[in-house]
Interface confidence: low
Amino acid sequence: KKVVLGKKGDTVELTCNASQKKNTQFHWKNSNQIKILGIQGLFLTKGPSKLSDRADSRKSLWDQGCFSMIIKNLKIEDSDTYICEVENKKEEVELLVFGLTANSDTHLLEGQSLTLTLESPPGSSPSVKCRSPGGKNIQGGRTISVPQLERQDSGTWTCTVSQDQKTVEFKIDIVVLAFQKASSTVYKKEGEQVEFSFPLAFTLEKLTGSGELWWQAERASSSKSWITFDLKNKEVSVKRVTQDPKLQMGKKLPLHLTLPQALPQYAGSGNLTLALEAKTGKLHQEVNLVVMRATQFQENLTCEVWGPTSPKLTLSLKLENKGATVSKQAKAVWVLNPEAGMWQCLLSDSGQVLLESNIKVVPTW
């Protein structure tokens, strides 16, 4: 018996071929022996089965000995053994219809769980294997669970349902609501303007919600709210902003914040949260600000950084075109009685310069 797998809502074609390539008498019946369709002269006739309004045949292929049955808008309960009777022979085709649906909204926040449920006919024992857009393979039986969605899970999931060594493929579009980055660090010299950007990893027709940036300055004992804002149909409006620092915010997406000046007292970590309308939970992005200052005071040349830096970062003071260098895995370096010339302060990670500041040391006569 031939087995054909179908998808709920789709169309399936069950083939039946006669040995002689000519138009001949045929019938399609279900397992209860109730006629679904057949041929009467040159006309397609339909029996009283529940498929009568959704079953059809390709009349153009009858004279080639092909007597297929097409079933439209498949339902799980269409799963059955169908019998084609032609030339005094019976051909049986077992149709198994499966449906795969997401249990919840397909727009989910990062960290939320996704459950895909397989609808299957009684008596079947299918297996399901799903592949995420990022190449993650998840397999299961009648349900597949992804406990914690990640941003790379956004996109089209391809799920293969296997039964009786046959397969049927489902495509489900999942949108993971998240920022493009979980965390970002901005490195600035003291006094420079700071730009924070928070691009979203998704697009929605209507995007409404509210957000807030909380900031924990390195020098401060507690965090404080720097800005709160509303989002209405992708338009940003500031609700409240601190006086110090006086942040500015772009009116359009992506969310964009400008800090007029990078100062040591602002160095630290922030957490931007965005609560979307009709969604439980919030989107988060961490942002870090590292500020560098190079100063000369009397006979001491000092370079300092403030903000969250990794212990493996190197801070160096280097005299341009000379070999004189002081390097430390620390947040401050200094040179006593520095030579005259252009000194560079460098913050680097494994040789890659993250931030640099130049300071000119004039000769003292």
């Epitope: 009684p122 024992s125 397999q139 299961g140 039986g141």
Partner: antibody, heavy 120, light 107 residues
Framework: QVQLLESGPGLVKPSETLSLTCTVS????????WSWIRQPAGKGLEWIGR???????NYNPSLKSRVTMSIDTSENQFSLNLSSVTAADTAVYYC??????????????WGQGTTVTVSS | DIQMTQSPSSLSASVGDRVTITCQAS??????LNWYQQKPGKAPKLLIY???TLETGVPSRFSGSGSGTDFTFTISSLQPEDIATYYC?????????FGGGTKVEFK
Amino acid sequence: QVQLLESGPGLVKPSETLSLTCTVSGGSISSYYWSWIRQPAGKGLEWIGRIYISGSTNYNPSLKSRVTMSIDTSENQFSLNLSSVTAADTAVYYCARELERPYYYGMDVWGQGTTVTVSS
Amino acid sequence: DIQMTQSPSSLSASVGDRVTITCQASQDISNYLNWYQQKPGKAPKLLIYNASTLETGVPSRFSGSGSGTDFTFTISSLQPEDIATYYCQQYDNLPLTFGGGTKVEFK
């Protein structure tokens, strides 16, 4: 972990109906097929049939005319009724969970079994 | 229904012996075959599925092979706790059917 326990009369008269219940504890009755298997003394295993959470059933054709299975999700129980019993139905009756995984279909959890004797 | 024929129906072996049981299906069942162990007075326990995959926690001395209609179950070195009856079971088609069993005992 999931445990199964069969219950029902140990003695049934010929021509009467054998009724057994299997109680599922330590887990949900959802998302699995639940089956009945029997084993006459000193003989092999025979699959009687199975039932799904939706109430859909599959029976062994050799017993189909006499078998009825039901499921009670609120009580976490499923049942077997075998009508018109004869001495040939004397056996140890097991309930089991049929677990489905990719490349796997097997009975991974079994009850301890209950002996049913058909005798007048 | 798919008939499952197991042989031998019983065998005697000593500790450390290699024990082999065969199972033949009446039609091609691909790899859809399980092996169960049943100790006296106990319920069966699944040892091998998909003809050759060892269930979690089952000792590696148990193995299975075969595809289509002919299958083999092997105990590489018989242990005292392996004394039991072993059954093959197909899951290619409903109804699920078992072999007649092979009783393994000591010489």
